[in-house]
């Protein structure tokens, strides 16, 4: 499938609009600090060049790889060293090292201002004045803040973003129409970014085998009627797509994702009965729909797993002949029977099975040795079941905000060295598992909860990797991808932690808190809670709750006062003194 000109090939496959959008995303994900106008200029130059190659594939430089072309273009940025420091050294390297260098400098937490949403009328005017620039700006702002965002999916978000403005800017009540849609896109976008970040971390930190194992388990749950060979083909193709996107090869990734969607829809009879509606949609919607499609029904009367994987005399022979294929079949068979298990649990079971076979197939009596292997699965299954049941009961008792606070205290005591903003962000997201998953029946709770927790804990891992401060976090993040959640669950209070010095400024609040949204106010209070725990890690939850209740009352009182600022100053001092006394600070 060799083409004289790769850039011409992708331009023709994707079309000009998608080509330009994907190049913009790629550049914004690499050079996260560059101004919008600079990126647009670079994209236009690349697009013009691509058109010359479409016209004549033998034209000068058209035979160069996309990495070479894009890298050369990025390296023309004049302010590279001033803006990015050592990233400029990447430009002295040759491909493929140069691209690897750019990838290593992607920043999961770039120092960029928070995106502030303008007034609806201002947005609608900007949309009408220059729709193309408005939508490009959206792609740019999301891509630079989320350098691993799944690019073809970002095109789908942009399409929905455009549709929201097209509809709502004509509505009688523009704000009532638009704001809920933008909120939904924002929340879905954050979730999509975090899910993709885990896929990239899986590939980059644990390798292709780890990602493929995850994909076998997930696709087998989703398509339990598909044959193993079919699932294997889908896994291979899906791995290629995500490897490309995570590697910055966004044009290839989008092209291959479209091909995969096409293949799935052409072969839906042998894949899943749930794909019909998805396959009637246009490309971007189709791909999104397939990625989110519900699990198909399990085939009737599937035989017991024990026959092939425990009772058979040929277990060790089959394993020795093709280890990964045999383990893949085990994972496929187990996963298609267990849509009620999380993917990470299925992977733990497969790992246990693999470890047992490695040990037993070298033993004097292999069958005797592995005969009870399925008994070893019981505690592995019960552990997340118990944890989820316990968490859901607590969520039911406390509600989301107080449940988040319970997790904030728990995680701050486990890893107090982690920065307060990271602890707040991660614990708030961990706490959302309650409203997201606890409403589900038992059979759907574990895949919802534990796989969501894997995504959130990966956020902690990638943020911590940027500035490592805790050996315990590093250990849980790097030892085993599938055991990250059990590793964090098992962490005890860090007894080596030296409490933070008390700083009254940390607990000084002003009248501006009164104008904040409920969410922002919660974050302020939760930030204070984390700081309290860092000052007094031995404080009981009841002591902390009492202080937090006093704090909430103080904010409510001062926000109702005529002279808010004076109230915050005077009552704030009293609150700090009372809290110090209550906690023995």
């Amino acid at each position: 499938d060799a083409h004289k000109s790769e850039v011409a090939h992708r331009f023709k496959d994707l079309g000009e609009e998608n080509f330009k959008a994907l190049v913009l995303i790629a550049f914004a994900q690499y050079l996260q600090q560059c101004p919008f106008e600079d990126h647009v200029k670079l994209v236009n130059e690349v697009t013009e060049f691509a058109k010359t190659c479409v016209a004549d594939e033998s034209a000068e430089n058209c035979d160069k790889s996309l990495h070479t072309l894009f890298g050369d273009k990025l390296c023309t940025v004049a302010t590279l060293r001033e803006t990015y420091g050592e990233m400029a050294d990447c430009c002295a390297k040759q491909e493929p090292e140069r691209n690897e260098c750019f990838l290593q400098h992607k920043d999961d937490n770039p120092n960029l201002p928070r995106l502030v949403r303008p007034e609806v009328d201002v947005m609608c005017t900007a949309f009408h004045d220059n729709e193309e620039t408005f939508l490009k700006k959206y792609l740019y702002e999301i891509a630079r803040r989320h350098p691993y965002f799944y690019a073809p999916e970002l095109l789908f978000f942009a399409k929905r973003y455009k549709a929201a403005f097209t509809e709502c800017c004509q509505a009688a009540d523009k704000a009532a129409c638009l704001l809920p849609k933008l909120d939904e896109l924002r929340d879905e976008g954050k979730a999509s970014s975090a899910k993709q970040r885990l896929k990239c971390a899986s590939l980059q930190k644990f390798g292709e085998r780890a990602f493929k194992a995850w994909a076998v388990a997930r696709l087998s749950q989703r398509f339990p009627k598909a044959e193993f060979a079919e699932v294997s083909k889908l896994v291979t193709d899906l791995t290629k797509v995500h490897t490309e996107c995570c590697h910055g090869d966004l044009l290839e990734c989008a092209d291959d994702r479209a091909d995969l969607a096409k293949y799935i829809c052409e072969n839906q009879d042998s894949i899943s009965s749930k794909l019909k509606e998805c396959c009637e949609k246009p490309l971007l919607e189709k791909s999104h729909c397939i990625a989110e499609v519900e699990n198909d029904e399990m085939p009737a009367d599937l035989p017991s797993l024990a026959a092939d994987f425990v009772e058979s005399k040929d277990v060790c022979k089959n394993y020795a002949e093709a280890k990964d294929v045999f383990l893949g079949m085990f994972l496929y068979e187990y996963a298609r029977r267990h849509p009620d298990y999380s993917v990470v649990l299925l992977l733990r079971l497969a790992k246990t099975y693999e470890t047992t076979l490695e040990k037993c197939c070298a033993a004097a009596d292999p069958h005797e040795c592995y005969a009870k292997v399925f008994d070893e699965f019981k505690p592995l299954v019960e552990e997340p079941q118990n944890l989820i049941k316990q968490n859901c009961e607590l969520f039911e008792q406390l509600g989301e905000y107080k449940f988040q606070n319970a997790l904030l205290v728990r995680y701050t005591k486990k890893v107090p060295q982690v920065s307060t903003p990271t602890l707040v962000e991660v614990s708030r997201n961990l706490g959302k598992v309650g409203s997201k998953c606890c409403k589900h029946p038992e059979a759907k709770r574990m895949p919802c909860a534990e796989d969501y927790l894997s995504v959130v804990l990966n956020q902690l891992c990638v943020l911590h990797e940027k500035t490592p401060v805790s050996d315990r976090v590093t250990k849980c993040c790097t030892e085993s991808l599938v055991n990250r959640r059990p590793c964090f669950s098992a962490l005890e209070v860090d007894e080596t932690y030296v409490p933070k010095e008390f700083n009254a400024e940390t607990f000084t609040f002003h009248a501006d808190i009164c104008t904040l949204s409920e969410k922002e106010r919660q974050i302020k209070k939760q930030t204070a809670l984390v700081e309290l725990v860092k000052h007094k890690p031995k404080a009981t939850k009841e002591q902390l709750k009492a202080v937090m209740d006093d704090f909430a009352a103080f904010v409510e009182k001062c926000c109702k006062a005529d002279d808010k600022e004076t109230c915050f100053a005077e009552e704030g001092k009293k609150l700090v003194a009372a809290s110090q006394a209550a906690l023995g600070l």
Partner: nanobody, 122 residues
């Protein structure tokens, strides 16, 4: 202040039974998770069983099927019925309580009793 007082420990033959009680005072415990940990000589404290505010029960694998945890909300008391005791159950048993009772680690529980000795002879 909060107090947890255990009782019911003692010396018992292997295969025998004991019933531990834990009376909680100092506040209302009806919304707390309550439970039991144990510590054998020279070992760490380990989880035995816990019961939630909704009376859902959780057990360590080593005691499942032999021990039963229950509570009386009105009396602020939690019980541990221990049957078919084994020598390896010998330990000091601690009653625990926590308003959030999330997890199975010792540090997940803020309130601890003084402990009651259980010795199982073979």
């Amino acid at each position: 202040q909060v107090q947890l007082v255990e009782s019911g420990g003692g010396l018992v033959q292997a295969g025998g039974s004991l019933r531990l009680s834990c009376a909680a005072s100092g506040r209302t415990f009806s919304n707390d998770a309550m439970g039991w940990f144990r510590q054998a000589p020279g070992k760490e404290r380990v989880f035995v069983a816990t019961i939630s505010w909704k009376s859902s029960t959780y057990y360590a694998d080593s005691v499942k099927g032999r021990f039963t945890i229950s509570r009386d909300h009105a009396k602020n008391t939690v019980y541990l019925q221990m049957n078919n005791l084994k020598p390896e159950d010998t330990a000091v048993y601690y009653c625990v309580a926590d308003p959030y009772g999330l997890g199975f680690n010792p540090s997940d529980y803020d309130y601890w009793g003084q402990g009651t000795q259980v010795t199982v002879s073979s």
